[in-house]
């Protein structure tokens, strides 16, 4: 339904508070380097303009599209050329090219300082002095560091952030109350950002069909009692929501997400029995709850899939009638029966089925050709099962830190050209699959592990895309979305890699390491491990373990010493020499 003024329509639908928050997020995700105050000024100007349109939808410029209004506003930033370089060229373009240009300049790894958490008392004072500015600053800092963060979900995080300060700044022990809550929000936020980044990559790099296939599989697992037509409707609506958010249309996205939550709750009887609690919550919590809701129970006595998809003589007729609908039904039927499979596995099975039909339906006797198609699924199912079994055994044997180190070595040998910070970040996250998923029973391990790995490997792909250095990474990232993990798993040591020159500076450590948190100290050690492997890619596990053990002992010894800096200088030289000898550098 067309509105005379799109900006007035969204302002009225969302309300002033959400409108302002979403415009701030949108601007911060586009202009990631701009100071907070500049963004607040732009948001206030847009908000005042929106109010004039609410009062009179026929007022000047109120009929302009949101992209035109927001783009025009962003292009008023005085320092655009100095701060953003070629991004300023976007402003010479017309819509929709201008918005596409802004989207292409979003930076997944912006050169921004790490967010340092102030003392609790300082935070509480700032919160009490100006709650609104304090919360806006949170939105701004998260949005500029995570330019694809799911905007309506960021509103939910901000609500929880506010609640944490409201409660804890009144507590007897503020720090004990607040810090665990902030840690939880930080970790959940990073996970949420990475999950959304995969959705946007799926849409932008592989297209709507790829995203819809993912959504059919996931929603069919989650709502196995819902009919195919119902799942299809939800998939269409969900695709619209994510297409909008990934495209920077945050007001439309938030509005449509609210409509989708409303529809799901009004129709929960035909969707899932698990939605009742979610649907009693306020909007932001409701949408979050629905997105995370557990899988409903599978209907009893579901018939065998073979009847409709292998044994029926009308398989090719049904496929010809509407290929994507028939494949969608196959995916729906398979997924609702297999909550124990990862979404990416289900998509691989559907792709195998499609390839088989393409080949067999062209034959004179199709049935004879596709009769054994389900046999082709067996190795595809067993591969992730075996991989997860092996890696969970390794995780249980080593613990998270050493499991991460094993993955660091494995991935550095596969793709040694990738930057050390990226290898450390990605391998640490890959290693978290152990504590996240290995505790689950068999039936939940694969969906947990393989779908999580898809999210982490997408981080590698988007970071690598910014500065491509490895053809192997490019190949695994671009050939097939659902085969990324098997592609990386299949990579062996890169024999073409010329080892990095030895640089003693890389292995020089100082007393400041002693004051770091355990996590930061681990990252330092893991950075050294990656550098070691880059210098000596043929080093054995045993050699690397010996050097790392020596390194850990050296850090522990010097951090206990009276003159720490001298210890690091003298013992460090000995350690480098011993390591060189041990590794034959």
């Amino acid at each position: 339904d067309a509105h005379k003024s799109e900006v007035a329509h969204r302002f009225k639908d969302l309300g002033e508070e959400n409108f302002k928050a979403l415009v701030l997020i949108a601007f911060a995700q586009y202009l990631q380097q701009c100071p907070f105050e500049d963004h607040v000024k732009l948001v206030n100007e847009v908000t005042e303009f929106a109010k004039t349109c609410v009062a009179d939808e026929s007022a000047e410029n109120c009929d302009k599209s949101l992209h035109t209004l927001f783009g025009d506003k962003l292009c008023t930033v005085a320092t655009l050329r100095e701060t953003y370089g070629e991004m300023a060229d976007c402003c010479a373009k017309q819509e929709p090219e201008r918005n596409e240009c802004f989207l292409q300049h979003k930076d997944d790894n912006p050169n921004l300082p790490r967010l340092v958490r102030p003392e609790v008392d300082v935070m509480c004072t700032a919160f009490h002095d100006n709650e609104e500015t304090f919360l806006k600053k949170y939105l701004y800092e998260i949005a500029r560091r995570h330019p694809y963060f799911y905007a309506p979900e960021l509103l939910f995080f901000a609500k929880r952030y506010k609640a944490a300060f409201t409660e804890c700044c009144q507590a007897a022990d503020k720090a004990a109350c607040l810090l665990p809550k902030l840690d939880e929000l930080r970790d959940e936020g990073k996970a949420s950002s990475a999950k959304q980044r995969l959705k946007c990559a799926s849409l932008q790099k592989f297209g709507e069909r790829a995203f819809k296939a993912w959504a059919v599989a996931r929603l069919s697992q989650r709502f196995p009692k819902a009919e195919f037509a119902e799942v299809s409707k939800l998939v269409t609506d969900l695709t619209k929501v994510h297409t909008e958010c990934c495209h920077g249309d945050l007001l439309e996205c938030a509005d449509d997400r609210a409509d989708l939550a409303k529809y799901i709750c009004e129709n929960q009887d035909s969707i899932s029995s698990k939605l009742k609690e979610c649907c009693e919550k306020p909007l932001l919590e409701k949408s979050h709850c629905i997105a995370e809701v557990e899988n409903d129970e599978m209907p009893a006595d579901l018939p065998s899939l073979a009847a409709d998809f292998v044994e029926s003589k009308d398989v090719c007729k049904n496929y010809a009638e509407a290929k994507d609908v028939f494949l969608g039904m196959f995916l729906y039927e398979y997924a609702r029966r297999h909550p124990d499979y990862s979404v990416v596995l289900l998509l691989r099975l559907a792709k195998t089925y499609e390839t088989t039909l393409e080949k067999c339906c062209a034959a004179a006797d199709p049935h004879e050709c596709y009769a054994k198609v389900f046999d082709e699924f067996k190795p595809l199912v067993e591969e992730p099962q075996n991989l997860i079994k092996q890696n969970c055994e390794l995780f249980e044997q080593l613990g998270e830190y050493k499991f991460q180190n094993a993955l660091l070595v494995r991935y550095t040998k596969k793709v040694p050209q990738v930057s050390t910070p990226t290898l450390v970040e990605v391998s640490r996250n890959l290693g978290k699959v152990g504590s996240k998923c290995c505790k689950h029973p068999e039936a939940k391990r694969m969906p947990c592990a393989e779908d999580y790995l898809s999210v982490v490997l997408n981080q590698l792909c988007v970071l690598h895309e910014k500065t491509p250095v490895s053809d192997r990474v490019t190949k695994c990232c671009t050939e097939s979305l659902v085969n990324r993990r098997p592609c990386f798993s299949a990579l062996e040591v890169d024999e073409t890699y010329v080892p990095k020159e030895f640089n003693a500076e890389t292995f020089t450590f100082h007393a400041d390491i002693c004051t770091l948190s355990e996590k930061e100290r681990q990252i330092k050690k893991q950075t050294a491990l990656v550098e070691l492997v880059k210098h000596k890619p043929k080093a054995t596990k045993e050699q690397l373990k010996a050097v790392m053990d020596d390194f850990a002992a050296f850090v522990e010894k010097c951090c206990k010493a009276d003159d720490k800096e001298t210890c690091f200088a003298e013992e460090g030289k000995k350690l480098v020499a011993a390591s060189q000898a041990a590794l034959g550098l």
Partner: nanobody, 114 residues
């Protein structure tokens, strides 16, 4: 939507000939194997002949081997059945189908009688 329309049937004397045509629309005809099936009054449906998408493979029921010839023109989206030396037992409604599926078109009546 998939549409298959058969034509070319009629009344013919034993030993005579007919050429059936099936005009296809609503799907990528060139990607699918096609068949002719027939149904005589009071009898089960019988598969007659099949052809692969690229015409490289042609199969026939024993009852029509040497008398019937299946062919196709992918550019025109047409399937053909050339029927020679027709016998009274060839009397039936003839349908063209995708793969070896069940008929969903009206078919064309072939009657062989003196």
């Amino acid at each position: 939507a998939v549409q298959l329309v058969e034509s070319g049937g009629g009344l013919v004397q034993p030993g005579g000939s007919l050429r059936l045509t099936c005009t296809a629309s609503g799907f990528t005809f060139r990607s699918f194997g096609m068949s002719w099936v027939r149904q005589a009054p009071g009898k089960d449906q019988e598969w007659v002949s099949a052809i692969s998408a690229d015409s490289s493979t042609k199969n026939y029921a024993d009852s029509v081997k040497g008398r019937f010839t299946i062919s196709r023109d992918n550019a025109k989206k047409m399937l053909y059945l050339e029927m020679n030396s027709l016998k009274p037992e060839d009397t039936a409604v003839y349908y063209c189908v995708i793969g070896r599926g069940s008929p969903s078109s009206p078919g064309t009546q072939v009657t062989v009688s003196s």
